[in-house]
Protein backbone atom coordinates (compact mmCIF):
# COMPACT_ATOMS: atom_id res chain seq x y z
CA UNK A 1 0.00 0.00 0.00
CA UNK A 2 1.20 3.39 -0.57
CA UNK A 3 3.16 5.53 2.19
CA UNK A 4 0.91 7.58 4.68
CA UNK A 5 1.89 10.36 2.72
CA UNK A 6 0.94 13.63 4.94
CA UNK A 7 3.35 16.62 4.87
CA UNK A 8 5.37 17.30 7.81
CA UNK A 9 3.66 18.27 10.83
CA UNK A 10 3.69 22.04 10.62
CA UNK A 11 4.34 22.22 14.76
CA UNK A 12 7.00 19.71 14.43
CA UNK A 13 5.14 17.71 17.05
CA UNK A 14 6.97 14.35 16.85
CA UNK A 15 5.18 11.77 18.91
CA UNK A 16 8.40 9.67 19.92
CA UNK A 17 11.79 10.48 20.56
CA UNK A 18 14.22 10.37 17.94
CA UNK A 19 16.56 7.02 17.63
CA UNK A 20 20.04 7.67 18.78
CA UNK A 21 22.63 7.83 15.93
CA UNK A 22 19.75 9.35 14.12
CA UNK A 23 21.95 9.51 10.65
CA UNK A 24 23.73 6.49 11.13
CA UNK A 25 20.32 4.60 10.74
CA UNK A 26 19.30 6.79 7.71
CA UNK A 27 22.99 6.52 5.94
CA UNK A 28 22.26 2.55 6.56
CA UNK A 29 18.65 2.33 5.23
CA UNK A 30 19.85 4.31 1.87
CA UNK A 31 22.38 2.00 1.74
CA UNK A 32 19.75 -1.27 1.97
CA UNK A 33 17.93 0.31 -0.34
CA UNK A 34 21.21 1.01 -2.52
CA UNK A 35 21.88 -2.70 -2.44
CA UNK A 36 18.53 -4.38 -3.49
CA UNK A 37 17.25 -1.09 -6.29
CA UNK A 38 18.96 -3.16 -8.97
CA UNK A 39 17.49 -6.37 -8.18
CA UNK A 40 14.09 -5.44 -8.00
CA UNK A 41 14.64 -3.49 -11.38
CA UNK A 42 15.59 -6.56 -12.89
CA UNK A 43 12.78 -8.19 -11.16
CA UNK A 44 10.36 -5.62 -12.50
CA UNK A 45 11.19 -5.86 -16.10
CA UNK A 46 11.47 -9.81 -16.22
CA UNK A 47 7.42 -10.16 -14.77
CA UNK A 48 6.89 -7.60 -17.45
CA UNK A 49 7.35 -9.88 -20.54
CA UNK A 50 8.14 -8.56 -24.00
CA UNK A 51 9.14 -5.91 -25.53
CA UNK A 52 10.71 -4.88 -22.29
CA UNK A 53 13.79 -6.48 -21.15
CA UNK A 54 15.27 -6.22 -24.72
CA UNK A 55 14.38 -2.30 -24.98
CA UNK A 56 14.86 -1.01 -21.64
CA UNK A 57 16.91 2.16 -22.61
CA UNK A 58 13.80 3.22 -24.65
CA UNK A 59 11.08 1.46 -22.17
CA UNK A 60 12.79 1.77 -18.87
CA UNK A 61 14.94 4.66 -18.84
CA UNK A 62 15.10 7.07 -15.82
CA UNK A 63 13.50 10.12 -17.35
CA UNK A 64 11.12 10.84 -15.62
CA UNK A 65 10.22 14.69 -16.05
CA UNK A 66 8.49 15.54 -12.72
CA UNK A 67 10.82 14.40 -10.51
CA UNK A 68 12.31 15.72 -7.58
CA UNK A 69 15.49 17.17 -7.84
CA UNK A 70 18.53 16.50 -5.26
CA UNK A 71 21.79 18.78 -5.12
CA UNK A 72 24.70 16.55 -3.14
CA UNK A 73 25.93 19.47 -2.83
CA UNK A 74 23.75 21.13 -0.23
CA UNK A 75 24.27 21.45 3.29
CA UNK A 76 22.56 18.60 5.17
CA UNK A 77 19.57 20.16 6.09
CA UNK A 78 19.32 20.74 2.53
CA UNK A 79 19.57 17.48 0.84
CA UNK A 80 17.54 15.96 4.02
CA UNK A 81 14.53 18.52 2.89
CA UNK A 82 15.23 17.28 -0.63
CA UNK A 83 15.67 13.36 0.30
CA UNK A 84 12.03 13.64 2.07
CA UNK A 85 10.85 14.80 -1.20
CA UNK A 86 12.27 11.95 -3.16
CA UNK A 87 10.83 9.49 -0.42
CA UNK A 88 7.81 10.75 -0.57
CA UNK A 89 8.02 10.61 -4.24
CA UNK A 90 9.42 7.20 -4.37
CA UNK A 91 6.67 5.91 -1.80
CA UNK A 92 3.43 6.67 -3.83
CA UNK A 93 5.21 5.68 -6.89
CA UNK A 94 6.08 2.58 -5.79
CA UNK A 95 2.31 2.21 -3.84
CA UNK A 96 0.76 2.58 -7.56
CA UNK A 97 3.34 0.36 -8.89
CA UNK A 98 2.45 -2.74 -6.53
CA UNK A 99 -1.01 -1.78 -6.97
CA UNK A 100 -0.70 -2.18 -10.67
CA UNK A 101 1.13 -5.37 -10.50
CA UNK A 102 -1.39 -7.04 -8.39
CA UNK A 103 -3.61 -6.85 -11.35
CA UNK A 104 -1.35 -7.01 -14.16
CA UNK A 105 0.84 -9.77 -12.74
CA UNK A 106 -1.15 -11.65 -9.88
CA UNK A 107 1.60 -14.56 -9.85
CA UNK A 108 4.81 -12.34 -9.63
CA UNK A 109 4.86 -13.14 -5.68
CA UNK A 110 8.27 -12.18 -5.64
CA UNK A 111 8.11 -9.13 -7.10
CA UNK A 112 4.79 -8.37 -5.16
CA UNK A 113 7.25 -9.19 -2.26
CA UNK A 114 10.30 -7.24 -3.02
CA UNK A 115 7.98 -4.07 -3.82
CA UNK A 116 6.58 -4.18 0.06
CA UNK A 117 10.34 -4.49 1.34
CA UNK A 118 10.77 -1.66 0.01
CA UNK A 119 7.78 0.56 0.59
CA UNK A 120 8.46 -0.92 4.15
CA UNK A 121 12.23 0.47 4.24
CA UNK A 122 10.88 3.66 2.77
CA UNK A 123 8.65 4.10 5.33
CA UNK A 124 10.99 4.29 7.97
CA UNK A 125 13.08 6.49 6.42
CA UNK A 126 10.76 8.84 6.00
CA UNK A 127 9.98 8.87 9.92
CA UNK A 128 13.81 8.98 10.36
CA UNK A 129 14.19 11.97 7.66
CA UNK A 130 11.39 13.55 9.20
CA UNK A 131 12.60 13.12 13.29
CA UNK A 132 15.81 14.89 11.48
CA UNK A 133 14.58 17.60 10.29
CA UNK A 134 12.29 18.78 12.93
CA UNK A 135 14.47 17.60 15.79
CA UNK A 136 17.59 19.21 15.14
CA UNK A 137 16.21 21.74 11.82
CA UNK A 138 13.23 22.78 13.74
CA UNK A 139 11.36 22.19 9.89
CA UNK A 140 7.70 22.26 10.21
CA UNK A 141 6.81 21.86 6.77
CA UNK A 142 8.35 20.36 3.39
CA UNK A 143 6.10 20.66 0.33
CA UNK A 144 6.23 17.52 -1.53
CA UNK A 145 4.91 16.32 -4.65
CA UNK A 146 3.76 12.80 -5.33
CA UNK A 147 4.39 10.17 -8.02
CA UNK A 148 2.24 10.07 -11.47
CA UNK A 149 -1.33 8.49 -10.88
CA UNK A 150 -1.68 5.30 -13.41
CA UNK A 151 -4.78 4.88 -12.36
CA UNK A 152 -6.22 5.58 -15.69
CA UNK A 153 -3.44 4.62 -17.89
CA UNK A 154 -3.57 1.45 -19.98
CA UNK A 155 -1.86 -1.78 -19.70
CA UNK A 156 1.28 -0.83 -21.43
CA UNK A 157 1.26 2.97 -20.41
CA UNK A 158 1.30 1.36 -16.28
CA UNK A 159 4.42 -1.49 -17.33
CA UNK A 160 6.13 1.62 -18.94
CA UNK A 161 5.49 4.28 -16.47
CA UNK A 162 6.32 1.67 -13.31
CA UNK A 163 9.49 0.74 -15.36
CA UNK A 164 10.94 3.96 -15.81
CA UNK A 165 10.28 4.94 -11.85
CA UNK A 166 12.30 2.09 -10.89
CA UNK A 167 15.03 2.84 -13.90
CA UNK A 168 15.12 6.56 -12.10
CA UNK A 169 15.01 4.81 -8.80
CA UNK A 170 17.86 2.58 -8.91
CA UNK A 171 19.62 5.70 -10.29
CA UNK A 172 19.02 7.92 -7.39
CA UNK A 173 18.99 5.59 -4.81
CA UNK A 174 22.99 5.12 -5.36
CA UNK A 175 23.38 9.16 -5.74
CA UNK A 176 21.88 9.18 -2.30
CA UNK A 177 23.26 6.63 -0.32
CA UNK A 178 26.73 8.34 -1.95
CA UNK A 179 25.79 11.54 -0.83
CA UNK A 180 25.25 10.60 3.04
CA UNK B 1 -28.26 -5.03 -13.75
CA UNK B 2 -26.04 -2.90 -14.92
CA UNK B 3 -26.98 -0.82 -17.90
CA UNK B 4 -25.81 1.68 -20.44
CA UNK B 5 -27.94 3.35 -22.84
CA UNK B 6 -27.05 5.81 -25.64
CA UNK B 7 -28.71 9.04 -26.53
CA UNK B 8 -29.07 11.78 -28.94
CA UNK B 9 -30.02 12.73 -32.84
CA UNK B 10 -30.39 9.82 -35.14
CA UNK B 11 -29.71 12.22 -37.59
CA UNK B 12 -26.89 15.47 -38.37
CA UNK B 13 -25.85 17.45 -41.03
CA UNK B 14 -22.32 17.32 -42.52
CA UNK B 15 -19.73 20.15 -40.90
CA UNK B 16 -22.12 19.51 -38.03
CA UNK B 17 -20.78 18.10 -34.27
CA UNK B 18 -22.74 14.69 -33.59
CA UNK B 19 -23.88 15.01 -29.98
CA UNK B 20 -24.52 11.56 -27.98
CA UNK B 21 -24.42 10.81 -24.33
CA UNK B 22 -24.44 7.68 -22.41
CA UNK B 23 -25.98 7.13 -19.42
CA UNK B 24 -25.28 4.32 -16.51
CA UNK B 25 -27.69 2.88 -14.48
CA UNK B 26 -27.65 0.25 -11.88
CA UNK B 27 -24.03 1.18 -11.63
CA UNK B 28 -21.93 3.98 -9.76
CA UNK B 29 -19.07 5.10 -11.44
CA UNK B 30 -16.21 3.42 -10.60
CA UNK B 31 -12.69 5.02 -10.12
CA UNK B 32 -11.63 2.08 -11.80
CA UNK B 33 -13.49 1.88 -14.69
CA UNK B 34 -12.91 3.48 -18.07
CA UNK B 35 -15.80 4.87 -20.53
CA UNK B 36 -15.44 4.20 -24.05
CA UNK B 37 -17.27 4.95 -27.01
CA UNK B 38 -17.10 2.17 -29.93
CA UNK B 39 -18.52 2.57 -33.87
CA UNK B 40 -19.71 0.51 -36.35
CA UNK B 41 -20.35 1.59 -40.14
CA UNK B 42 -22.58 0.22 -41.93
CA UNK B 43 -21.69 -3.35 -42.86
CA UNK B 44 -18.79 -2.66 -41.55
CA UNK B 45 -16.36 -3.35 -38.62
CA UNK B 46 -15.89 -2.19 -35.07
CA UNK B 47 -13.72 0.61 -34.37
CA UNK B 48 -12.80 2.15 -31.41
CA UNK B 49 -12.85 5.79 -31.26
CA UNK B 50 -11.54 6.22 -27.54
CA UNK B 51 -12.22 6.66 -23.30
CA UNK B 52 -12.62 8.96 -20.19
CA UNK B 53 -11.33 7.52 -16.99
CA UNK B 54 -13.54 8.61 -14.39
CA UNK B 55 -10.99 8.80 -11.61
CA UNK B 56 -8.54 11.88 -10.37
CA UNK B 57 -6.03 11.88 -13.18
CA UNK B 58 -9.37 12.05 -15.68
CA UNK B 59 -6.72 10.58 -18.68
CA UNK B 60 -8.59 10.08 -22.12
CA UNK B 61 -7.37 8.65 -24.94
CA UNK B 62 -8.76 9.49 -28.68
CA UNK B 63 -7.88 7.05 -31.77
CA UNK B 64 -5.50 9.14 -33.56
CA UNK B 65 -7.20 9.01 -36.92
CA UNK B 66 -9.95 10.68 -34.87
CA UNK B 67 -8.18 12.81 -32.42
CA UNK B 68 -8.39 15.97 -33.59
CA UNK B 69 -12.50 15.78 -34.08
CA UNK B 70 -12.81 14.37 -30.56
CA UNK B 71 -14.14 15.18 -27.19
CA UNK B 72 -15.02 12.46 -24.98
CA UNK B 73 -16.66 14.57 -21.11
CA UNK B 74 -18.09 13.27 -18.05
CA UNK B 75 -20.72 13.98 -15.75
CA UNK B 76 -20.25 12.13 -12.29
CA UNK B 77 -23.09 13.63 -10.65
CA UNK B 78 -25.79 12.52 -13.75
CA UNK B 79 -23.88 9.37 -14.15
CA UNK B 80 -23.27 10.32 -17.77
CA UNK B 81 -20.63 10.29 -20.41
CA UNK B 82 -20.52 12.24 -23.91
CA UNK B 83 -19.12 11.67 -27.17
CA UNK B 84 -18.73 15.02 -29.22
CA UNK B 85 -17.49 14.71 -32.83
CA UNK B 86 -17.07 17.60 -35.16
CA UNK B 87 -16.95 18.70 -38.79
CA UNK B 88 -19.07 15.14 -39.53
CA UNK B 89 -19.52 13.63 -42.93
CA UNK B 90 -21.61 11.06 -44.06
CA UNK B 91 -18.05 8.50 -43.62
CA UNK B 92 -19.28 9.22 -39.68
CA UNK B 93 -22.49 7.38 -40.30
CA UNK B 94 -22.71 4.74 -38.43
CA UNK B 95 -23.89 2.78 -34.98
CA UNK B 96 -22.23 4.19 -32.14
CA UNK B 97 -22.08 2.26 -28.71
CA UNK B 98 -20.86 3.50 -25.38
CA UNK B 99 -18.90 0.62 -23.66
CA UNK B 100 -17.27 -0.16 -20.05
CA UNK B 101 -13.95 -1.69 -19.05
CA UNK B 102 -12.65 -3.00 -16.09
CA UNK B 103 -9.37 -2.70 -14.77
CA UNK B 104 -6.35 -3.07 -16.30
CA UNK B 105 -9.19 -1.37 -19.20
CA UNK B 106 -8.23 -4.58 -21.79
CA UNK B 107 -11.68 -5.68 -22.77
CA UNK B 108 -14.87 -4.44 -23.05
CA UNK B 109 -17.32 -6.40 -20.71
CA UNK B 110 -20.20 -3.99 -20.61
CA UNK B 111 -22.13 -2.20 -24.29
CA UNK B 112 -24.86 -0.25 -24.89
CA UNK B 113 -27.52 -0.94 -27.07
CA UNK B 114 -26.14 1.05 -29.79
CA UNK B 115 -27.61 4.57 -31.74
CA UNK B 116 -27.46 4.82 -35.59
CA UNK B 117 -26.69 8.32 -35.99
CA UNK B 118 -26.91 8.90 -40.07
CA UNK B 119 -24.99 12.06 -41.64
CA UNK B 120 -27.38 13.59 -44.49
CA UNK B 121 -28.15 17.06 -45.29
CA UNK C 1 1.04 1.54 -33.68
CA UNK C 2 -0.64 -1.39 -33.32
CA UNK C 3 -2.50 -3.26 -36.10
CA UNK C 4 -4.84 -5.90 -35.79
CA UNK C 5 -5.55 -8.58 -38.70
CA UNK C 6 -7.50 -11.05 -38.69
CA UNK C 7 -8.14 -14.23 -40.67
CA UNK C 8 -9.73 -15.82 -42.83
CA UNK C 9 -12.45 -12.70 -43.47
CA UNK C 10 -15.16 -15.46 -43.55
CA UNK C 11 -15.69 -19.04 -43.78
CA UNK C 12 -18.75 -21.12 -44.21
CA UNK C 13 -18.34 -24.77 -42.24
CA UNK C 14 -20.47 -27.37 -41.52
CA UNK C 15 -22.79 -27.65 -37.80
CA UNK C 16 -20.31 -29.79 -36.24
CA UNK C 17 -17.28 -28.69 -37.47
CA UNK C 18 -14.37 -27.51 -35.90
CA UNK C 19 -13.51 -23.69 -36.69
CA UNK C 20 -10.70 -21.82 -36.18
CA UNK C 21 -9.97 -18.08 -36.32
CA UNK C 22 -6.85 -16.16 -35.90
CA UNK C 23 -5.58 -13.05 -35.21
CA UNK C 24 -2.17 -11.38 -35.26
CA UNK C 25 -0.92 -8.29 -33.54
CA UNK C 26 1.55 -6.34 -35.40
CA UNK C 27 3.80 -6.42 -32.30
CA UNK C 28 3.54 -7.87 -28.71
CA UNK C 29 0.22 -7.80 -27.15
CA UNK C 30 1.70 -10.04 -24.07
CA UNK C 31 -1.86 -11.97 -22.90
CA UNK C 32 -4.52 -8.89 -23.90
CA UNK C 33 -6.71 -10.10 -26.48
CA UNK C 34 -10.34 -10.46 -26.28
CA UNK C 35 -12.90 -12.17 -28.80
CA UNK C 36 -16.59 -11.06 -29.44
CA UNK C 37 -19.42 -12.26 -31.29
CA UNK C 38 -21.51 -10.22 -33.27
CA UNK C 39 -24.92 -11.60 -34.70
CA UNK C 40 -26.84 -9.14 -37.52
CA UNK C 41 -28.32 -6.28 -35.64
CA UNK C 42 -27.03 -6.90 -32.32
CA UNK C 43 -24.80 -5.64 -29.83
CA UNK C 44 -20.95 -7.09 -30.07
CA UNK C 45 -20.57 -9.89 -26.80
CA UNK C 46 -17.51 -10.73 -24.93
CA UNK C 47 -16.57 -14.21 -25.36
CA UNK C 48 -13.52 -14.48 -24.08
CA UNK C 49 -10.62 -12.12 -22.54
CA UNK C 50 -7.26 -12.23 -21.84
CA UNK C 51 -6.46 -14.92 -24.51
CA UNK C 52 -8.30 -17.76 -23.21
CA UNK C 53 -10.60 -17.01 -19.93
CA UNK C 54 -13.90 -17.68 -20.92
CA UNK C 55 -16.67 -15.09 -20.18
CA UNK C 56 -19.41 -16.30 -17.84
CA UNK C 57 -22.31 -17.79 -19.59
CA UNK C 58 -20.52 -18.58 -22.63
CA UNK C 59 -20.70 -22.40 -24.00
CA UNK C 60 -17.76 -24.34 -23.52
CA UNK C 61 -17.12 -25.44 -27.18
CA UNK C 62 -15.70 -21.94 -27.63
CA UNK C 63 -11.74 -21.72 -26.69
CA UNK C 64 -8.62 -18.95 -27.11
CA UNK C 65 -5.24 -19.80 -27.01
CA UNK C 66 -1.77 -17.36 -28.11
CA UNK C 67 0.48 -15.17 -26.65
CA UNK C 68 2.73 -12.60 -27.72
CA UNK C 69 1.06 -11.59 -31.13
CA UNK C 70 -0.68 -14.44 -32.46
CA UNK C 71 -3.85 -15.38 -31.29
CA UNK C 72 -6.39 -18.43 -32.15
CA UNK C 73 -10.09 -18.72 -31.57
CA UNK C 74 -11.65 -22.20 -31.56
CA UNK C 75 -15.18 -23.51 -32.08
CA UNK C 76 -15.25 -27.34 -31.10
CA UNK C 77 -18.49 -28.03 -33.16
CA UNK C 78 -20.15 -25.43 -34.59
CA UNK C 79 -23.59 -24.69 -33.82
CA UNK C 80 -26.49 -23.28 -35.84
CA UNK C 81 -26.80 -20.21 -33.36
CA UNK C 82 -23.04 -19.92 -33.73
CA UNK C 83 -23.48 -17.77 -37.38
CA UNK C 84 -22.15 -14.27 -36.25
CA UNK C 85 -19.25 -12.17 -37.26
CA UNK C 86 -16.38 -12.58 -34.77
CA UNK C 87 -13.23 -9.91 -34.06
CA UNK C 88 -10.76 -9.47 -31.61
CA UNK C 89 -9.50 -6.86 -30.36
CA UNK C 90 -5.96 -5.89 -28.51
CA UNK C 91 -6.08 -4.73 -25.39
CA UNK C 92 -2.44 -3.85 -24.25
CA UNK C 93 -1.82 -0.09 -25.66
CA UNK C 94 -4.45 1.97 -26.91
CA UNK C 95 -1.68 5.09 -26.88
CA UNK C 96 -1.26 6.03 -31.24
CA UNK C 97 -3.51 2.67 -32.27
CA UNK C 98 -5.93 3.76 -34.95
CA UNK C 99 -8.17 1.07 -33.81
CA UNK C 100 -7.81 -2.21 -31.39
CA UNK C 101 -9.79 -4.43 -33.09
CA UNK C 102 -9.52 -6.94 -35.80
CA UNK C 103 -11.07 -6.04 -39.17
CA UNK C 104 -13.53 -9.27 -38.14
CA UNK C 105 -14.79 -12.88 -39.57
CA UNK C 106 -17.60 -13.54 -40.87
CA UNK C 107 -18.71 -17.44 -40.29
CA UNK C 108 -21.60 -19.09 -41.52
CA UNK C 109 -23.10 -22.66 -42.17
CA UNK C 110 -22.70 -24.41 -45.41
Known amino acids: SPLPITPVNATCAIRHPCHNNLMNQIRSQLAQLNGSANALFILYYTAQGEPFPNNLDKLCGPNVTDFPPFHANGTEKAKLVELYRIVVYLGTSLGNITRDQKILNPSALSLHSKLNATADILRGLLSNVLCRLCSKYHVGHVDVTYGPDTSGKDVFQKKKLGCQLLGKYKQIIAVLAQAF | QVQLQESGPGLVKPSDTLSLTCTVS?????????WSWIRQPPGKGLEWIGY?????????YYNPSLKSRVTISVDTSKNQFSLKLSSVTAADTAVYYC????????????WGQGTLVTVSS | DIQMTQSPSSLSASVGDRVTITCRASETISGYLAWYQQKPGKVPKLLIYRASTLQSGVPSRFSGSGSGTDFTLTISSLQPEDVATYYC????????????FGGGTKVEIK
Open chain 2, 99 to 110: AGADNPYDYFNL
Open chain 2, 26 to 34: GFSFSTDYW
Open chain 3, 89 to 100: QQGYSYSDTDNV
Open chain 2, 52 to 60: IYVGTSGDT
